[in-house]
């Protein structure tokens, strides 16, 4: 039969070459002389000449060593022809399988592998995976089957078996308790890959395992006791810098300190922040301290980290004794703003009030007083007693200095400390109205026709306050009532002036006396221009003549 079974040829054969592999034979050779040939890759096409055939005998020849890793199988065709070149058989398939030899060592995909694992983990925790390849066959033989192992570990602390490697997958995992970044931050493992499933050629690489930080160390105060001195009343004053040490990774959340005042700050006088670089706790005053109230504060400060502890850790506490230093404090007027009612127009030298300050300091300091701002110059202040007296006429109706009945004065108190300090107070004099202004009509000039005259309505104003105002009363004096009448309206706030007899065109003085509800009388002269006209007029028609 014109067939041939698959031919297995080991790679790397040592010859001699050409090497006879198998004989092609057609049973047609009984009838005629047969010539054999082969075609295909490895024969007459690239890679040419690897195989040949003895033309007359049919022996298939191998001309050189084979490399399975280059070509693992050759597919050729055998041909049989008669002397005249006629084909006597169909082309026959010839399969040549190159069998593997263990001629390659494993190769790691990297010279150095890097992985990491959190400190303090339990055995079983995966760290990283390493990979080696082997070009040899791993399906039909063990030549390319790689087994992984750890050859050595540096350092060997706390002992030499901290990691293991899965022999087939190359996954490195933790095998021991005791990974401690603060003691060993990095391990270097020499790893091996061995073919023949661990019984063949070996190659090595390095696996570097970084031990990652966990917050397994508490920050500790160093020192734990502090004494500080702070002047009283200072706000935002740096009291003390507290120093901590933490074995965890610097500038990580497991290292950065968080401070908390645990006790001793009943009045919420202090605050503590973390310095972003030094990690120190900066204790400052949130409010001013009062030496006279409490001259010493004992604070208890606890420190933790930004990150939570991964296990139960004792927290460190610092004690800070803060001594409050006495400073000469300014006198304080009591109250800071004093409202006093006083009648306007009181006589000069009349007392207005006593306005004094208290000194927070415990020493019996002498306080002296003076007026700092008195816009109208109406007041004086006794430097020893704080007695305020009138030296000018207090006028409620003075619109330049009085607003809403209130006259505002600033006073100053000075102690005799070294250096002296001053405090200010505000004296608000509420001026009580006195009926010191009579009613005044508006306008005080009128123009009126001498025929069918229109009544002239004048508004009445009084600078005083009720009840020293309306209802008003009007009266004409100095014979003005011969030609004129004056009547106050029902509401009592306007006066109606009427011409009751004919007057020739001229300007006349009308003497009008107005009195308020408190009978304060005010005489006002109204200038009346009488025109030759009927009814309503604003200016006299034609040339004006004086009279």
């Amino acid at each position: 039969d014109w067939v041939v079974a698959p031919i297995s040829v080991p790679e790397n054969g040592k010859g001699p070459f050409p090497q006879r592999l198998n004989q092609l034979k057609s049973n047609k050779d009984r009838d005629t002389k047969i010539f054999y040939s082969i075609t295909g890759p490895g024969a007459d096409s690239p890679p040419e000449g690897v195989f040949a055939v003895e033309k007359e005998t049919g022996w298939l020849l191998l001309n050189k060593p084979l490399d399975r890793e280059e070509i693992a199988k050759y597919e050729l065709f055998g041909h049989a022809v008669s002397e005249n070149g006629a084909s006597v058989e169909d082309p026959m398939n010839i399969s040549i399988i190159v069998t593997d030899q263990n001629d390659h060592k494993p190769k790691f995909t990297q010279d150095t592998f890097r992985g990491s694992v959190l400190e303090g983990v339990l055995p079983g925790t995966s760290v990283m995976q390493v990979t080696a390849t082997d070009e040899d066959d791993a399906i039909y033989t063990y030549n390319g089957v790689v087994a992984y192992s750890i050859h050595s570990q540096e350092p060997k602390d706390p002992h030499d078996l901290m990691f293991t490697i899965h022999r087939s997958t190359g996954t490195i995992s933790v095998i021991s308790s005791g990974l401690d970044r603060e003691k060993v931050p990095e391990y270097t493992l020499t790893i091996q890959a061995t073919d023949m499933d661990g019984d063949g050629s070996t190659t090595t690489a390095v696996a570097v395992v970084e031990i990652l930080d966990a917050n397994d160390n508490a920050p500790m105060f160093d020192p734990q006791k502090y004494e500080a001195h702070v002047p009283e009343n200072a706000v935002g004053h740096e009291v003390q810098r507290l120093t901590v040490t933490d074995l965890d990774a610097p500038n990580s959340p497991a290292w950065r300190a968080t401070y908390l005042i645990m006790g001793g700050d009943d009045g919420d006088h202090f605050t503590i922040t973390t310095h972003p670089e030094s990690n120190q706790g900066i204790l400052t005053t949130r409010k001013g301290l009062d030496f006279e109230a409490k001259n010493q504060h004992t604070l208890y400060v606890e420190v933790t980290n930004e990150a939570p502890f991964v296990l139960k850790l004792p927290t460190s506490t610092a004690t800070i004794v803060v001594h409050v230093e006495d400073v000469n404090e300014a006198p304080v007027f009591v109250p800071p703003s004093k409202v006093v009612e006083v009648q306007e127009g009181i006589p000069t030298g009349e007392p207005v009030c006593v306005y004094t300050a208290e000194d927070p300091d415990k020493e019996n300091q002498k306080i002296s007083y003076r007026i700092l701002r008195d816009p109208a110059g109406w007041l004086a202040m006794d430097p020893d007693s704080g007695q305020v007296t009138a030296v000018g006429t207090l006028d409620r109706e003075d619109e330049q200095f009085v607003r809403n009945n209130i006259y505002e004065v600033m006073v100053l108190a000075m102690d005799n400390g070294s250096p002296p300090t001053t405090g200010t107070g505000t004296l608000l004099l509420t001026l009580i109205d006195v009926n010191d202004h009579g009613p005044v009509p508006e306008p005080r000039q009128i123009t009126i026709c001498n025929q069918s005259p229109v009544r002239q309505v004048l508004n009445i104003t009084d600078k005083d306050l009720s009840p020293h105002t309306s209802p008003f009363q009007a009266q004409l004096t100095d014979d003005s009532d011969i030609y004129w009448t004056a009547e106050v309206n029902e509401e009592g706030d306007t006066v109606v002036l009427s011409l009751k007899k004919f007057l020739k065109q001229d300007t006349y003085d009308v003497h009008l006396s107005l009195s308020d509800h408190g009978n304060k009388e005010q005489l006002t002269v109204i200038r009346a221009t009488v025109c030759d006209c009927h009814g309503h007029v604003e200016t006299c028609p034609g040339p004006w003549k004086g009279g």
Partner: antibody, heavy 117, light 111 residues
Framework: EVQLLESGGGLVQPGGSLRLSCAAS????????MSWVRQAPGKGLEWVSA????????YYADSVKGRFAISRDNSKNTLYLQMNSLRAEDTAVYYC??????????WGQGTMVTVSS | QSALTQPASVSGSPGQSITISCTGT?????????VSWYQQHPGKAPKLILS???KRPSGVSNRFSGSKSGNTASLSISGLQAEDEADYYC???????????FGGGTKLTVL
């Protein structure tokens, strides 16, 4: 002498709680991962829970996850197992065991936990 | 159902040798050389007798030896003695949160 001494076992009703302790002496306690291993009457050994030397890492068997909590106090050289929502199948002798690598050595003498109504 | 398979019982006469097998998978026994063996006498705590397949802790008789082939580890006891009668458990390391797998235990009877 290396020694582990369990305590805290006893009779408890289903749904109840119990806290086991294991006092260690004779070795550097904080260098050892610690485990609880139990053995039901007439049965084999069953690993229950483990905790790393620092206490920062814990493991639990699926059968006890969410009900048991392992902890340790290295300053007292003591291991604990807080057992809540106890069931009849939790009845066993509970051993504490130390491990530097992946073998259990030393072992305690065990404490009996009985869950029964 | 235990993760590692052991015969429920084996027996032997004094002076004889016996072997107890412990079969796992390619991810535990087959993957790592971290098989340990424990001896437990009735009413007592387990005691480590072999670690890392074949390493004996100090104080353990050299009659105990261990080996591993593929996914199966074995404990051999030569020159059986009456005090060897006990339960024997194997454990194997495996990666993951159940980092120690236990065998179901083998009861050794010395006839």
């Amino acid at each position: 002498e290396v020694q582990l001494l369990e305590s805290g076992g006893g009779l408890v009703q289903p749904g109840g709680s119990l806290r086991l302790s294991c006092a260690a002496s004779g070795f550097t306690f904080s260098s050892y991962a610690m485990s609880w291993v139990r053995q039901a009457p007439g049965k084999g050994l069953e690993w229950v829970s483990a905790i790393s030397g620092s206490g920062g890492s814990t493991y639990y068997a699926d059968s006890v996850k969410g009900r048991f909590a392992i902890s340790r106090d290295n300053s007292k050289n003591t291991l604990y197992l807080q057992m809540n929502s106890l069931r009849a199948e939790d009845t066993a002798v509970y051993y504490c065991a130390g491990s530097r690598t992946v073998q259990f050595d030393p072992w305690g003498q065990g404490t009996m936990v009985t869950v029964s109504s | 159902q235990s993760a590692l398979t052991q015969p429920a019982s084996v027996s032997g006469s004094p002076g004889q040798s016996i072997t107890i097998s412990c079969t796992g998978t390619s991810n535990d026994v087959g993957a790592y050389n971290y098989v340990s063996w424990y001896q437990q006498h009735p009413g007592k705590a387990p005691k480590l007798i072999l670690s890392e397949v074949n390493k004996r802790p100090s104080g353990v008789s050299n009659r105990f030896s261990g080996s591993k082939s593929g996914n199966t580890a074995s404990l051999s006891i030569s020159g059986l003695q009456a005090e060897d009668e006990a339960d024997y458990y194997c454990t194997s390391y495996t990666m993951g949160s159940t980092f120690m797998l236990f065998g179901g235990g083998t009861k050794l009877t010395v006839l």
